[in-house]
């Protein structure tokens, strides 16, 4: 095992357990965790005499550290007597020590709450010459506190004779105050009102506030499509940096590996928005081996403006795999928009929630601005849905009437892509789309779990998800069918099936 | 309250340098850059450049690279300005600014100081 | 860089008026635009920031408003002390430039 130092602990018992004519008493000191031995404990025992007995060292089972007890006994007037141990550790290091100073016993007591108050800005939320610092030391059990100043760690040389205390009943309340000029309260050093009470520490820091609320600088950290990942693999994540003050580019954004491999070369790109604020993004292309084999990557975000750099990582989801179900659908012809149709696609149950879409047209795939896809929403098993809606064109169907919706997702076998094709006008039973008219739509209760309309053909309708009764001037069953699903709080999304 | 106070006003000959400062107080000094205004009599309002107090980083004008450096003593919360080899267009009032936090304006700007250069 | 193009360059005004000053941007510089006071002898003093945003402590008497790259100022009544030189400035790209200026004299 390696050196090791000792933590030291004071042994009392509480005074209440004292008989109140004991002439002797006895106390302790605990030093524990070190090693190697020995420890040499010492006592200060002021004007008493004491006689001290240290027990033999004993190993600690797990660390195979080492523990010891130092019992000083001491007669006489020791009730207001304050007691010093001193615990060297020579093999930590030459002068290595720690005292202890405490009484006899300790006091059932409420301790002190801390709190520093600081005087207001002036009308013109500017700082005045001085600025006042005020310790509130309140609600404790009556007892001799002592109240010490610290400038960034430093002790202050503060005259506390100003120091009041008052009593509200059995607890008592003190107030310290600090005066700081303006300068050195600009200076951005941390003030702290340290209270030593009942051998305890308690305190409260302050510092002055940021100048302007850098109205909550956010950073986020995406991770590679699986588009990206597996079908061009090229992964890219981005680190975004959204509402910062723009300070003319001195935000700095530094990527590096969990792994302390070094990083390829990223891409940085600034955009100033209508709200005054600068929008910052980092690209870092990624290695799809590194990636899958589960390296993480962080962003560290720095700027005049946050009081300590932003830290955000990324890595490869872990958790449970489930492969997407694709389900491609068209709408029927509404009036007065011949020309054009919706096709939506349903992809769903799929883990973890990383998913690429994307639109196919005669083997050529549709630019990502042509669909519009939702953003991955749990489902109420454990896996997650998207929407995705393309708009096709009379003159695209008529050129192929084939359009494919395809999923990229990791869990999909072989290739890590699932695809529906989807037509606009399949050839159905009882005329095509656009010569009939559409059917009532069908709000679909499911209980437990939404109903889906089949994609085939002359298939029947999932059995949670009835059709309507369709119309007088509808010819014979409804063969199309709008499945509703009313989500609590939300627009309704709806999708169109055959039934 | 925000101020920024510059040194005063400095005659100098063609081909001297100087050096003008600008010290700020009543804010965190290295929460903001500073940026360097000049105004030659008469006329508008010429940007020269921008100093980070929190890191140091500097950007100048096209026009004035290579013959200014601005630097920054955060012990003491001073912009400096330093313009070498003068030449008679120089001759100009020299204005630090505060850059402000959202748009980038020139919030706070020192009083001025007078620069002549004159053989 | 991009130029800023201020108009009038001059104008006379009487105390009361309404005194309208434009400022047209030689590219898309969105609403980062801003507007300053400088009065003889003295440092400018911002007005505007964000084309419409009034620093805090100016009169209200004195807004901003954009129109795609053609901005405003406006002084709803003109105040004895308003007569002086204003200038816009453009700080959506390095370096910033300033308009040329417009002088408000007294008529």
């Known amino acids: 095992a390696s050196t090791q130092s000792p933590s030291v602990f004071p042994l009392t018992r509480c005074c209440k357990n004292i008989p109140s004519n004991a002439t002797s008493v006895t106390l302790g000191c605990l030093a524990t965790g070190y090693f190697p031995e020995p420890v040499m404990v010492t006592w200060d025992t002021g004007s008493l005499n004491g006689t001290t007995m240290t027990l033999p060292a004993t190993t600690l089972t797990l660390s195979g550290h080492y523990a010891t007890i130092s019992l000083l006994t001491v007669s006489g007037a020791w009730a207001k007597q304050m007691f010093t141990c001193r615990v060297a550790h020579t093999p930590s290091s030459t002068d290595w020590v720690d005292n202890k100073t405490f009484s006899v016993c300790s006091r059932d007591f409420t301790p002190p709450t801390v709190k520093i108050l600081q005087s207001s800005c002036d009308g013109g939320g500017h700082f005045p010459p001085t600025i006042q610092l005020l310790c509130l030391v309140s609600g404790y059990t009556p007892g001799t506190i002592n109240i010490t100043w610290l400038e960034d760690g430093q002790v202050m040389d503060v005259d506390l004779s100003t120091a009041s205390t008052t009593q509200e009943g059995e607890l008592a309340s003190t107030q310290s105050e600090l005066t700081l000029s303006q300068k050195h309260w600009l200076s951005d050093r941390t003030y702290t009102c340290q209270v030593t009470y009942q051998g305890h520490t308690f305190e409260d820091s302050t510092k002055k506030c940021a100048d302007s609320n850098p109205r909550g600088v956010s950073a986020y950290l995406s991770r590679p499509s699986p588009f990206d990942l597996f079908i061009r693999k090229s992964p890219t994540i981005t680190c975004l940096v959204v509402d910062l003050a723009p300070s003319k580019g001195t935000v700095n954004l530094t990527w590096s590996r969990a792994s302390g491999k070094p990083v390829n070369h990223s891409t940085r790109k600034e955009e100033k928005q209508r709200n005054g604020t600068l929008t910052v993004t980092s690209t870092l292309p990624v290695g799809t081996r590194d990636w899958i084999e589960g390296e993480t990557y962080q962003c560290r975000v720095t700027h005049p403006h946050l009081p300590r750099a932003l830290m955000r990582s990324t890595t490869k989801t872990s958790g449970p795999r489930a492969a997407p179900e694709v389900y491609a659908f068209a709408t029927p012809e509404w009036p007065g928009s011949r020309d054009k149709r919706t096709l939506a696609c349903l992809i769903q149950n799929f883990m973890p929630e990383d998913i690429s879409v994307q639109w196919l047209h005669n083997e050529v795939q549709l630019p990502d601005a042509r669909h519009s896809t939702t953003q991955p929403r749990k489902t109420k098993g454990s896996g997650f849905f998207v929407f995705s809606r393309l708009e096709v064109t009379r003159a695209e169907w008529e050129q192929k009437d084939e359009f494919i919706c395809r999923a990229v997702h990791e869990a999909a076998s072989p290739s890590q892509t699932v695809q529906r094709a989807v037509s606009v006008n399949p050839g159905l039973a009882g005329g095509s789309a656009q010569s009939q008219r559409a059917p009532d739509r069908v709000l679909c209760h499911s209980g437990q779990q939404q109903g889906l309309p089949r994609a085939a053909g002359g298939s029947v309708p999932h059995p949670r998800c009835h059709c309507g009764a369709g119309r007088a001037d509808w010819p014979g069953p409804p063969e199309l069918d709008v499945c509703v699903e009313e989500a609590e709080g939300e627009a309704p999304w709806t999708w169109t099936g055959l039934c | 309250q925000v101020q920024l106070v510059q040194s005063g006003a400095e005659v100098k000959k063609p081909g001297a340098s100087v050096k003008v400062s600008c010290k700020a107080s009543g804010y965190t000094f290295t929460s903001y850059g500073i940026s360097w205004v000049r105004q030659a009599p008469g006329q508008g309002l010429e940007w020269m450049g921008w100093?980070?107090?929190?890191?140091?980083?500097?950007n100048y004008a096209q026009k004035l690279q290579g013959r200014i450096t601005m630097t920054t003593d955060t012990s003491t919360s001073t912009a400096y300005m330093e313009l070498r080899s003068l030449r008679s267009d120089d001759t100009a009032v020299y204005y630090c600014a505060r850059d402000g936090d959202y748009y980038d304006p020139f919030d706070y700007w020192g009083q001025g100081t007078l620069v002549t250069v004159s053989s | 860089d991009i130029q800023m193009t201020q108009s009038p360059s001059s104008l006379s005004a009487s105390v009361g008026d309404r005194v309208t000053i434009t400022c047209r941007a030689s590219q898309s510089i969105s609403n980062w635009l801003n507007w300053y006071q400088q009065k003889p002898g003295k440092a400018p003093k911002l007005l505007i920031y964000?084309?419409?945003s009034l620093k805090s402590g100016v009169p209200s008497r004195f807004s901003g408003s954009e129109s795609g790259t053609d901005f405003t100022l406006t002084i709803s009544s003109l105040q004895p002390e308003d007569f002086a030189t204003y200038y816009c400035q453009q700080s959506y790209s390095t370096p910033p430039t300033f308009g040329q200026g417009t002088k408000v004299e007294i008529k």
């Open positions: 100093i980070s107090a929190y890191n140091g980083n500097t």
């Open positions: 964000g084309a419409s």
